[in-house]
């Protein structure tokens, strides 16, 4: 049974899916495989802290140490990547802080900046000295295993020389790598001896071999790409938003809710209201009114704008976001001051009603 009563039966229109959902990201902690990682739960006044990873309880084990407000992961592996949360339980409420962990090797086999001056990789030979292909910069090829988070860009490099200048081609899992083998294709920068794949997906996992050859010989080098996956998760709301606000009667005010969601988010702005002089229904649940929601006829649903406010507009405003996996809610208070008082932006505190997280 829902823990609120809607004041009116609002029929929600079908949503128009946006082209992208990411509006803001939770904080990301990056570690290389084998490294240790320590994260402090950024919540105050916690009596008890509990930890989860991708929604599942996280307990101590031989690699995971939980001490007070600290989480330590020893000898991190790509499997440690995911969406983490710490929940601070207090006597009257609880609060959750989300963060991402990416355990990943460097994104490319050579720094991206190299592309601006690839001349050092392009070795010119005296035309008389015929020479089979050879590697010119083995340091950039040392890292063979690349564990990369999904949606990142990957660059593999095989800087080579030879005379005549060798040609380069790429194989995936031992077979010719064709543009149609992946959505969006790939780029080959012959000048930089590089293969670039943007926005990698799990199906990009595999062995990538550069074959560098001329009429005097052939050399090859293989990289292994692992795309680190993450389970889908419910929406995440940026901490501190919406922020408490105050304005004078007749003034305008804006509440903002920043959302990060893997899947289509449905955003609702809800306010506690009174009906027949009461804030609660016969069942003891608060009366709520949907002020705005994402949909075809709704402009930027992450922003709730109130114009020419009256004292009746004062109160708590809830940003509620849901996707097929679950929900997230945060709220803020609006204080409406008499005209003679100057308004000021209050400290950004999120207040949550009982039934919210």
């Amino acid at each position: 049974r829902p823990s609120f009563s809607l004041v009116e039966d609002t029929t929600l229109e079908p949503e128009e899916p946006p082209t992208k959902y990411q509006i803001s990201q939770p904080e990301v902690y990056v570690a290389a495989p084998g490294e240790s990682l320590e994260v402090r739960c950024l919540l105050k006044d916690a009596a008890v802290i509990s930890w989860t990873k991708d929604g599942v309880h996280l307990g101590p084990n031989n690699r995971t140490v939980l001490i007070g407000e600290y989480l330590q992961i020893k000898g991190a592996t790509p499997r440690d990547s995911g969406l983490y949360a710490c929940t601070a339980s207090r006597t009257v409420d609880s609060e959750t802080w989300y963060f991402m962990v990416n355990v990943t090797d460097a994104i490319s086999s050579g720094d991206d900046e190299d592309d601006t001056d690839g001349a050092e990789d392009f070795v010119s030979e005296n035309s008389n000295n015929k020479r089979a292909p050879y590697w010119t910069n083995t340091e950039k090829m040392e890292k063979r295993l690349h564990a990369v988070p999904a949606a990142n860009t990957v660059k593999f490099r095989c800087p080579a020389g030879g005379n005549p200048m060798p040609t380069m081609r790429w194989l995936k899992n031992g077979k010719e790598f064709k543009q149609e083998h992946r959505i969006g294709g790939y780029k080959v920068r012959n000048q930089h001896w590089s293969l670039i794949m943007e926005s990698v997906v799990p199906s990009d996992k595999g062995n990538y071999t550069c074959v560098v050859e001329n009429e005097y010989g052939s050399i090859n080098h293989t990289y292994h790409l692992d795309v680190v996956e993450r389970s889908p998760h419910r929406p995440i709301l940026q901490a501190g938003l919406p922020a408490n606000a105050s304005t004078v009667v007749g003034g305008d005010v804006e509440f903002v809710c920043k959302v990060y969601s893997d899947a289509q988010p449905h955003i609702q702005w809800i306010k506690h209201v009174e009906k027949n002089g009461s804030k609660y229904g016969p069942d003891g649940l608060p009366y709520l009114k949907v002020l705005k929601h994402s949909g075809i006829n709704s402009s930027n649903a992450e922003v709730l704008a109130l114009f020419n406010v009256t004292e009746a507009d004062a109160g708590e405003y809830i940003c509620k976001v849901s996707n097929y996996i679950g929900q997230a809610n945060q709220s803020a208070w609006l204080t409406v001051l008499p005209k003679q008082q100057a308004p000021g932006r209050e400290k950004e505190i999120t207040a949550s009603p009982d039934y919210l997280e």
């Epitope: 599942v56 889908p232 929900q327």
Partner: antibody, heavy 114, light 107 residues
Framework: QVQLVQSGAEVKKPGSSVKVSCKAS????????VHWVRQAPGQGLEWIGS????????TYDEDYRGRATITADKSTSTAYMELSSLRSEDTAVYYC???????WGQGTLVTVSS | DIQMTQSPSSLSASVGDRVTITCKGS??????IAWYQQKPGKAPKLLIY???YRYSGVPSRFSGSGSGTDFTFTISSLQPEDIATYYC?????????FGQGTKLEIK
């Protein structure tokens, strides 16, 4: 590990109601929707509705609105789906699934027969 | 409601074959589509979510692609254990509709 365990098979008369339970374990029950999906014999999958256990928000396919009631008990990490005014065409296997559809119950066969 | 039209409804292929199933949405759903495998008497099993993301533990021969209204599910090299019925599902807006299913058999 994550598990969803459903109640046993039911045989019901037309016009009656059935209530199927789904007990969750291995994850934070209040952090994920619970979906209900049904499959008639030899047919495809059909989404009935879902609930967010933390606040009881539920949503339904229009075909089931008013006839299906999805509830959740946070204290026992159990979701329920009650279907009323049963007819023979409601004979199906009813599944519960976690919000991300990565974990499903074993299914509950409901047979409606006079 | 968003209708998901899946094709073919059944197909027969040999071990080692590349198998492709398509799903078309009546409305744009960005990349909010999942693919499931269901074997007789068992619950569906999530293979792909968000159009192209393979779920943990799913073999690499299974892949998905597409965006908007047109989506493709591929088994790169069919194995005997892949015999099952496959479903697409949009998880963009409620109701979260499924395709009609594709029954895959071995030749």
């Amino acid at each position: 590990q994550v598990q969803l365990v459903q109640s046993g098979a039911e045989v019901k008369k037309p016009g009656s109601s059935v209530k199927v339970s789904c007990k969750a374990s291995g994850y934070i029950f209040t952090s994920y929707n619970v979906h209900w999906v049904r499959q008639a014999p030899g047919q495809g999958l059909e989404w009935i509705g879902s609930i967010y256990p933390d606040n009881g928000d539920s949503t339904y396919d229009e075909d089931y609105r008013g006839r299906a009631t999805i509830t959740a008990d946070k204290s026992t990490s159990t979701a329920y789906m009650e279907l009323s005014s049963l007819r023979s065409e409601d004979t199906a296997v009813y599944y519960c699934a976690r919000g991300d559809f990565a974990y499903w119950g074993q299914g509950t066969l409901v047979t409606v027969s006079s | 409601d968003i209708q998901m039209t899946q094709s073919p409804s059944s197909l027969s292929a040999s071990v080692g074959d590349r198998v492709t199933i398509t799903c078309k949405g009546s409305n744009g759903i960005s990349n909010d589509i999942a693919w499931y495998q269901q074997k007789p008497g068992k619950a569906p099993k999530l293979l792909i979510y968000s159009a192209s993301y393979r779920y943990s533990g799913v073999p690499s021969r299974f892949s998905g692609s597409g965006s908007g209204t047109d989506f493709t599910f591929t088994i790169s090299s069919l194995q005997p254990e892949d015999i099952a019925t496959y479903y697409c599902q949009q998880h963009s807006t409620t109701p979260y509709t499924f395709g009609q299913g594709t029954k895959l058999e071995i030749k």
